[in-house]
């Protein structure tokens, strides 16, 4: 049986049940290669409390559909008197990056995971030439996830004192220049994740090969190498390579630019101080507030919730968007879709789509950007579920009693962007990270 998601095959992936201190290793095409789980384990569970290993999914006992992968085992489990077998179930959803498997829950018999990934899309529009896993768990099983830094189009410029060259990078995947409006970047060779431009010439100085690594707490490393044989004439016989070290800052701060810290014979060392390198719980919340010792800040957007069936309305040319954030109030137009953001076509108001659901909410504060994300909306033709990204700006003089109002700023591939100026986005900092 052919592997259902070949892009995911090259790596062993990790997921964590934080509540129970359990680390899962997952290899969807082969076995995880952990002796304690046996030679054919596709999903190996490491219980760190009891220091035991169990195979909870066998690579030989795999069954697959386009959106579900199940690994059975021969191990019996007793669930309400029935004689079931232990199994793992991975539900796949279309995403814009390779993504990460997320642990959902476990019963006595079934271990459930969810994975939003390009590999599950109906169309190839989000697929990279080359992409590697872009997250890592540290020794305390805290997740560090650089997926939000991945650019689907374009690149980051590395701060470099050399006026004659420009070094462009992407994170964990190659640079896509298809949307380039005609700049230097367009000359970059396909597949490169680190592109050096000198004058009108562009050179591949690194492609992603291995996934993100953690070197020590709050320092993550990504390495790119030039795959192609044939040395570049300005590299003195060496093969180019790029090492990017992502550093979690010691206290809250605005984002910084990736900086070139060393360069010798086409070996480029880059340091990027960014809060995305910090563990995810420091940056994100599933509620509309971020506060406490863990986050070093106090943010509370709950006053933006609308009661009594009213919604914020944002005009989007052909569409109207109805938003009801930070609550579970149904938007009247949205046909009981549990939508936090509802898209209604002006010319035909029966055409209604959920552009993100209130149960699928993430509040993120990172590198000075405050963002509320709603995902899991109605599917687009690519298979990607519509999502909305609301970028908040602090405005102490916002109208509407300080609440302000969301402004639609555009749509890219079924992701709807809004900006929202409000006094409730003014962040209060504590200083003790």
């Amino acid at each position: 049986q052919a592997a259902p998601f070949p892009e995911l095959c090259s790596y062993t992936w990790e997921a964590v049940d934080t509540k129970n201190n359990v680390l899962y290793k997952i290899n969807i095409c082969g076995s995880v290669d952990i002796v304690q789980c046996g030679p054919s384990s596709a999903v190996c569970m490491h219980d760190l409390k009891t220091r035991t290993y169990h195979s909870v999914g066998d690579s030989v006992l795999r069954s697959a559909t386009r959106s579900l992968l199940e690994f059975n085992t021969t191990v019996s489990c007793d669930q309400q008197g029935t004689n079931h077998r232990v199994q793992s179930s991975i539900a796949f959803l279309c995403g814009k990056t390779l993504g990460t498997p997320e642990f959902v829950t476990a019963t006595e018999c079934v271990h459930y995971f969810e994975w939003r990934t390009t590999a599950a899309c109906k169309k190839d529009i989000f697929k990279a030439n080359k992409e590697v896993p872009c997250y890592v768990f540290d020794e305390e099983l805290r997740k560090h996830d650089l997926n939000p830094l991945i650019k689907l189009s374009g690149a980051y410029l590395v701060d470099d004192s050399d006026p004659d060259t420009s070094l462009f990078i992407n994170v964990c995947r190659d640079i896509d220049t298809l949307r380039d409006p005609g700049s230097q970047l367009r000359a970059c060779p396909p597949g490169t994740a680190a592109c050096l431009v000198r004058g009108h010439q562009a050179f591949d100085v690194g492609q992603p090969r291995d996934g993100l690594k953690v070197v020590r707490k709050d320092r993550l490393v990504l390495s790119y190498v030039r795959e192609e044989a044939g040395k570049l004439d300005f590299c003195d016989g060496h093969s180019p390579a790029v090492t990017i070290t992502f550093v979690c800052p010691s206290e809250r701060r605005e984002g910084t630019i990736p900086k070139l810290t060393a360069k010798s014979n086409c070996r480029y060392e880059i340091e990027w101080i960014t809060e995305y390198a910090c563990h995810r719980d420091y940056l994100e919340s599933k509620t509309c507030s971020l506060s406490g010792e863990q986050q070093d800040v106090s943010i509370d957007l709950t006053p933006l919730a609308q009661s009594g069936g009213s919604s914020y309305i944002s005009d989007g040319k052909e569409y109207l968007f109805y938003l009801n954030v930070c609550g579970e109030t149904e938007i009247q137009f949205c046909n009981k879709k549990q939508a936090a953001v509802c898209q209604v076509k002006k010319s035909d108001t029966s055409q209604v789509k959920a552009a993100g659901r209130y149960h699928n909410q993430t509040l993120r504060y990172s590198d000075g950007d405050l963002t509320l994300i709603y995902f899991g909306g109605d599917e687009c033709s690519s298979g990607f579920q519509r999502m909305s990204v609301i970028n908040f700006e602090c405005n102490k003089t916002a109208g509407n009693d300080g609440k302000g109002t969301p402004v639609f700023t555009g749509e890219v591939d079924c992701t709807y962007e809004f900006t929202w100026d409000t006094e409730y986005a003014c962040v209060h900092h504590h200083h003790h990270h």
Epitope: K151, S153, G154, A155, Y156, L157, D159, S166, F168, T177, R179, D180, P181, G182, S183, Q184, L185, R186, I257, P258, D369, V389, N391, E393, T409, G410, E411, V412, E417, T419
Partner: nanobody
């Protein structure tokens, strides 16, 4: 490629104000970072201001900080440059441009240049 048309230039006295507009055609408007640049006679094209597409984060050349403001109206696919307290040294042709590179002020990282609009500051 994106097509850009700048407007709003003209003759203004020192200390005066102008608002430049840049209309962009193309539905990928909001996938770009946008910049204003200027070129005075006999000089290199220089960075003035930029705005990131995914948020309202802005950056400015030191020479215009506190006097110029870049903004955008995504509904109208338009970028603006509000110029206050104008000085004779602000005289130049002003261009807007698009880039898919984050954190850049380098003109060679921008493309789809418009034809420019002339701003003259003189008494």
């Amino acid at each position: 490629d994106v097509q850009l048309v700048e407007s709003g230039g003209g003759l203004v006295q020192p200390g005066g104000s102008l608002r430049l507009s840049c209309a962009a055609s193309g539905r990928t408007f909001n996938t770009y970072n946008w910049g204003w640049f200027r070129q005075a006679p006999g000089k290199e094209r220089e960075f003035v201001a930029a705005i990131r597409w995914s948020s309202s984060k802005t950056s400015y050349a030191d020479s215009v900080k506190g006097r110029f403001t870049i903004s955008r109206d995504n509904a109208k696919n338009t970028i603006y440059l509000q110029m206050n307290s104008l000085r004779p040294e602000d005289t130049a042709v002003y261009y807007c441009a698009a880039s898919i590179v984050d954190f850049t002020t380098n003109p060679s990282h921008f493309g789809s240049w418009g034809q420019g609009t002339l701003v003259t500051v003189s008494s």
